[in-house]
Interface confidence: medium
């Protein structure tokens, strides 16, 4: 095969948004629509990611950068670069093969994703349960029973944490 050879790699002159086309004597060709190259000197352009179905487009593809996806409402991203979308559940639930299921007694989930986790065992830290756990909230551990000796000042339970975005009543 005949080709003019130079000491410098001819592909190194190709900027981002182009590719060094092997089939065209290594000229710099623009990435065609729906493809991109994010760095210079590339031998190929990558096909743009398409955000279809449960994915929605967060950032459009350009000739120099890939599209970015997130998930439609009711789903959340999993994996690097939102490679998967997983169904949301309510707080106090976890996603199983059969759908969203309530957390078993003794476990909680305070998010719309992830699994139910066991309540904290306060006694392992020598503390007592100050506020009981629910399906949505972990227990709140308080001082150890020994700290509540006669004559000690009474403990005021902390105010419950407000949900983000809720204004005080």
């Amino acid at each position: 095969f005949e080709r003019t050879r130079s000491l410098q790699d001819p592909c190194s002159n190709c900027p981002a948004g182009t590719f060094c086309d092997n089939n065209r004597n290594q000229i710099c060709s623009p990435c065609p629509p729906n493809s991109f190259s994010s760095a210079g000197g590339q031998r190929t352009c990558d096909i743009c990611r398409q955000c279809k179905g449960v994915f929605r487009t967060r950032k459009e593809c350009s000739s120099t950068s890939n599209a970015e996806c997130d998930c439609t409402p009711g789903f959340h991203c999993l994996g690097a670069g939102c490679s998967m979308c997983e169904q949301d559940c309510k707080q106090g639930q976890e996603l199983t093969k059969k759908g969203c299921k309530d957390c078993c007694f003794g476990t909680f989930n305070d998010q719309k994703r992830g699994i139910c986790r066991p309540w904290t065992n306060c006694s392992l830290d020598g503390k007592s349960v100050l506020v009981n756990g629910t399906k949505e909230r972990d227990v709140v551990c308080g001082p150890s029973p020994a700290d509540l000796s006669p004559g000690a000042s009474s403990v005021t339970p902390p105010a419950p944490a407000r949900e983000p975005g809720h204004s005080p009543q």
Partner: antibody
């Protein structure tokens, strides 16, 4: 579905020329490279060159560049390969192939192959 | 030109066997390596492109691996319909070049 249908077998005398056709269907003809690959009896595959139907840009292997001509007719979605000054060692099955692009533009794999055309060169 | 060397040139294996074919390039081909299957009736099909990606419709018992100059095609459990000659091909640099082929037969 993608199809590449080649012309029938040819018997030629040494010094003559042969022109093999390859009719494409089932995809956008002008958007993908067409290659020609040959296989001599009992031998491996040998890439001869390719053509981009949109603008007729061609690449030929150095071994064939003085004897091969690749052309296309976009009205019939057909590519032609003409090999001249035939000799006995040109006896082979000639394949046309479509180059697909997979995940990367500019990286080509021959994703569909014609059925092959047998060319026999004999005096 | 880049030379492609396949080994073995032929092999005989039993149904259910794991079969491995190797392909070595004379220089680094940056994973631009394709595998093709040529059946006894001379029809040719793409099996694997870009070293390890399965072409549509190809059974999952076929897989590819490798990098740099050394590449491998593996059939995890040989089937009777896999009787064929297998070719590697580099897509890194023109002219595109093929290995000499590996003829696979059933014992």
């Amino acid at each position: 579905q993608v199809q590449l249908v080649q012309s029938g077998a040819e018997v030629k005398k040494p010094g003559a020329s042969v022109k093999v056709s390859c009719k494409a269907s089932g995809y956008t003809f002008t958007s993908y490279w067409i290659n020609w690959v040959r296989q001599a009896p009992g031998q491996g595959l040998e890439w001869m060159g390719n053509i981009y139907p949109s603008d007729s840009y061609t690449n030929y292997d150095q071994k064939f560049k003085d004897r091969v001509t690749m052309t296309r007719d976009t009205s019939t979605s057909t590519v032609y390969m003409e090999l001249s000054s035939l000799r006995s060692e040109d006896t082979a099955v000639y394949y046309c192939t479509k180059s697909g692009e997979y995940g990367k533009i500019g990286y080509y794999a021959m994703d569909y192959w014609g059925q092959g055309t047998t060319v026999t060169v004999s005096s | 030109d880049i030379q492609m060397t396949q080994s073995p040139s032929s092999l005989s294996a039993s149904v259910g066997d794991r079969v491995t074919i190797t392909c070595r390039a004379s220089q680094d081909i940056s994973n631009y390596l394709n595998w093709y299957q040529q059946k006894p009736d001379k029809t040719v099909k793409l099996l694997i492109y870009y070293t390890s990606r399965l072409h549509s419709g190809v059974p999952s018992r076929f897989s590819g691996s490798g990098s740099g100059t050394d590449y491998t095609l593996t059939i995890s459990s040989l089937q009777p319909e896999d009787i064929a000659t297998y070719f590697c091909q580099q897509g890194n640099t023109l002219p595109y070049t093929f290995g000499q082929g590996t003829k696979l037969e059933i014992k």
